[in-house]
């Protein structure tokens, strides 16, 4: 009874040409020890033969005691509960299906695992929370689906092509589940971050270029503004007018509302990115600022200091 | 049962080569490796090689290479040691066995030999 | 290669005694994939060679319980804890771990 027998695995492992892969395996055959197990490549089954056709990658009954450092295909399991698989190095054209012909005293099953090697390393994968904010710590992460202990590789991030100063942490996980390299980086962005490129760099155990991913970060933020007066130095006499003008050099996302506070109160009737105050009185004295909101919230200038002074 | 059956002995001249069978019954011959063990009075016994029937890969020790060549008839279930330039030295008993396990490793079964004698 | 040093080489016993052989690797017999493939076999007068134990000490299914092996790196002993008149013949330990693989030069057990 063919059911008797179970798996556990990852459904595909991807790796890329002289790279290696590592296959975490589980298996359980009811009825007793495993008697031999072959590795096949793209397995056919021959209705004429009652045999599988394909290319032995590995037989135990012929590989099983050849030193480990002679194999490029390597069974790391045995012959009751561990399937494991080495392929190192592993081959473009060794994409495709990879069938465990697994034979105990009274049964036979055929396992399959998909491989998919690139002719180049393929790109890491950048995650992003789905939000960012200024001064907000956010978590980047850094996939690669794929792992090998024959071959060390790392990740690393960059900002505008500069390395980022933060410490990542980089964990992979070899397991029936999944495999995996991941490297995740808490990173507190400024608005100035707003719009550079962030790059996760997959690299060898020498650093030497692999591939990567970027992604330009989107930082949610207040309006941030300059204000400029005329004239420059913000001292006028009684009856002169003044101008003050209110630029927002980033909003993200765009403003809505423009106000002019005077003192920390509120100008009313005075919603443009200008200013004009005519024929200036001792009574306007004081600290003038723009305050621009958008769905963050509300971003001010800084301070201008106006001072009438007596005609 | 498993069952490795040797030719008969073999009187061979000085120079000559002289080429043993051993007819494997009971298993599935191709998936398991054969090797030959040589047997002189008095001298142990030494490790000539092996072949892997599936496929004809073999190994052989460094003291045999050029003196033995080993062959195998999947269809007749028959491994075949050939030995070459024969001397004195050659005469002895000459062994096939199986290695018997995927996990293990062991010479399981054994043919009952086979002698040579080198003599003119 | 690995030479394979057997002592002793004639053992005289009594039915009913211990025997022990030991087998002494010239350098380490340790397989790269972690197993050790020292096996020891008896072989008889005019008979072929019979397997005893495998991986240092497993027992051969069919093998009386009153031979053990046991052993690690480069010393192995085989113990026969009562010898018996069909144990008497020549015992052989045996690397098979790595290339060319060796045999031991033999002991003879006999009845003294």
């Known amino acids: 009874d063919s059911s008797k027998w179970v798996f556990e695995h990852p459904e595909t492992l991807y790796a890329w040409e002289g790279a290696c892969v590592w296959i975490p395996c589980t298996y359980r055959a009811l009825d007793g020890d495993l008697e031999s197990f072959i590795l096949f490549h793209n397995p056919e089954y021959n209705k004429n033969t009652s045999k599988f056709d394909g290319t032995r990658l590995y037989e135990s009954t012929k590989d099983g005691k050849v030193p480990s450092e002679q194999k490029r295909v390597q069974f790391l399991g045995d012959k009751n509960k561990n399937c494991t698989l080495s392929i190192h190095p592993v081959h473009l054209n060794d994409s495709g299906q990879l069938g465990l012909r697994m034979e105990s005293k009274t049964e036979k099953w055929m396992e399959r695992i998909h491989l998919n090697v690139s002719e180049r390393p393929f790109p890491p994968h950048i995650q992003l929370p789905p939000e960012i904010q200024e001064s907000q710590e956010v978590t980047l992460t850094c996939l690669l689906n794929f792992s090998c202990y024959g071959y060390p590789i790392q990740l690393q991030w960059l900002l505008e092509g500069v390395p980022m100063r933060q410490a990542a942490v980089t964990s992979t996980s070899l397991t029936i589940k999944s495999v995996f390299t991941r490297s995740e980086l808490k990173f507190s962005p400024q608005w100035s971050h707003h719009g550079k490129i962030v790059t996760c760099q997959l690299q060898d155990a020498d650093g030497k270029f692999l591939s990567n991913d970027t992604v330009q970060l989107n930082v949610k933020h207040t309006p941030k503004l300059e204000i400029k007066v005329t004239p420059s130095d913000a001292i006028v006499r009684e009856g002169d007018s003044v101008t003050m003008t209110c630029e927002v050099s980033s909003s993200n996302p765009e403003y809505t509302t423009v106000s002019w506070l005077k003192d920390g109160t509120s100008l009313k009737k005075q919603n443009t990115f200008t200013l004009n105050l005519r024929e200036v009185t001792k009574d306007q004295s004081g600290k003038y600022c723009c305050q621009v909101s958008n769905d963050v919230g509300p971003g001010r200038s800084e301070e201008v200091f106006l001072q009438v002074q007596y005609a | 049962q498993v069952q490795l059956q040797q030719s008969g002995p073999e009187l061979v001249k000085p120079g000559a080569s002289v080429k043993i069978s051993c007819k494997a019954s009971?298993?599935?011959?191709?998936?398991?490796?054969m090797n030959w063990v040589k047997q002189r009075p008095g001298q142990g016994r030494e490790w000539i090689g092996r072949?892997?029937?599936?496929?004809?890969?073999?190994n052989y020790s460094g003291k045999f290479k050029g003196k033995a060549t080993l062959t195998a008839d999947k269809s007749s279930s028959t491994a075949y040691m050939q030995l070459s330039s024969l001397t004195s030295v050659d005469s002895a008993v000459y062994f096939c066995?199986?290695?018997?396990?995927?996990?293990?490793?062991?010479?399981?079964?054994w043919g009952a030999g086979t002698t040579v004698t080198v003599s003119s | 290669d690995i030479l394979m040093t057997q002592t002793p080489l004639s053992l005289p016993v009594s039915l009913g005694d211990q025997a022990s052989i030991s087998c002494r690797s010239s350098?380490?017999?340790?397989?790269?994939?972690?197993?050790?493939?020292l096996e020891w076999y008896l072989q008889k007068p005019g008979q072929s060679p019979k397997l005893l134990i495998y991986k240092v000490s497993n027992r051969f299914s069919g093998v009386p319980d009153r031979f053990s092996g046991s052993g690690s790196g480069t010393d192995f002993t085989l113990k026969i804890s009562r010898v018996e008149a069909e144990d008497l013949g020549v015992y052989y330990c045996f690397q098979g771990s790595q290339f060319p693989y060796t045999f031991g030069g033999g002991t003879k057990v006999e009845i003294k």
């Open positions: 066995a199986r290695d018997g396990s995927s996990w293990d490793w062991y010479f399981d079964v």
């Open positions: 072949i892997y029937p599936g496929d004809g890969d073999t």
């Open positions: 350098q380490s017999i340790v397989h790269s994939n972690g197993n050790t493939f």
């Open positions: 009971g298993y599935e011959f191709s998936r398991s490796w």
